[in-house]
């Protein structure tokens, strides 16, 4: 999987969208690694 900063941000956006945004407040691009996915 792509692990660039932009890929991580888009992937997290998709995850947040699918979860309805119900995730921890600290679940943001700069403090989740690719392993979080």
């Amino acid at each position: 999987a792509c692990d660039t900063a932009t890929c991580v941000t888009h992937r997290l956006a998709g995850l947040l969208s699918r979860s309805g945004g119900v995730v921890k407040n600290n679940f943001v691009p700069t403090n989740v690694g690719s392993k979080a996915f």
């Epitope: 660039t4 900063a5 890929c7 941000t9 888009h10 997290l12 943001v28 691009p29 700069t30 403090n31």
Partner: antibody, heavy 119, light 107 residues
């Protein structure tokens, strides 16, 4: 409203350094990566590097490694790009850009800073 | 580094025309491609991400497609305000790289 406001135009001599600032507002600065991109006259956009404002970790384009330095001041929500050993080919418009998820899922760019390198 | 080759480098079309700009990557970048619109003297504005997804607020006449090495930006019905230079970008690998730009003019 999300804004990335960059510092003003600079004129530098060959061999000098320049430091461009990018002040972020309207979102949580440390949550999103900050990219730096430049555009020389008549040339394609060129990615310089990216910084994680939360950790300070950087990734650079090999072309600029050793000459470009990306830093942040978290307390001021400001990112900086310093380029050293300037040459005429570094004459360009320099942009900061950040891809956000909140408050809006969008790729925001600063207004650009013109750096002219001339003897 | 990944080379992004855009074509054409410039084009002239009439209002209402369907316009297609292509971008070819030198190796597989999946769908990790973005498209930007840049008007003279302005910063690039994001249009498309992940090859085919429009950002909110981008008119529906703009669409993107492709995967692997071949990508397309289509404007279904050209409007006067679409006069600009369009750039593709791959973000699958560091360093991110851009196409050389396509300058779009109205006939």
């Amino acid at each position: 409203e999300v804004q990335l406001v960059q510092s003003g135009a600079e004129v530098k001599k060959p061999g000098a350094s320049v430091k461009v600032s990018c002040k972020a507002s309207g979102y949580t600065f440390t949550d999103y990566y900050m990219n730096w991109v430049r555009q020389a006259p008549g040339q394609r956009l060129e990615w310089i590097g990216v910084i994680n404002p939360y950790t300070g970790r950087t990734t650079y384009n090999r072309k600029f490694k050793g000459r470009a330095t990306l830093t942040v001041d978290k307390s001021a929500s400001t990112a900086y790009m310093e380029l050293s050993s300037l040459r005429s080919e570094d004459t360009a418009v320099y942009y900061c850009a950040s891809l956000l998820i909140r408050p809006h899922y969008f790729d925001y760019w600063g207004q650009g800073t013109t750096v002219t390198v001339s003897s | 580094d990944i080379q992004m080759t855009q074509s054409p480098s410039s084009l002239s079309a009439s209002v209402g025309d369907r316009v297609t700009i292509t971008c070819k990557a030198s190796q597989n970048v999946g769908t990790n491609v973005a498209w930007y619109q840049q008007k003279p003297g302005k910063s690039p504005k994001a249009l498309i991400y992940s090859a085919s997804y429009r950002y909110s607020g981008v008119p529906s006449r703009f669409s993107g497609s492709g995967s692997g090495t071949d990508f397309t930006l289509t404007i279904s019905s050209l409007q006067p305000e679409d006069v600009a230079t369009y750039h593709c970008q791959q973000y699958n690998f560091y360093p991110y790289t851009f196409g050389q730009g396509t300058k779009l003019e109205i006939k």
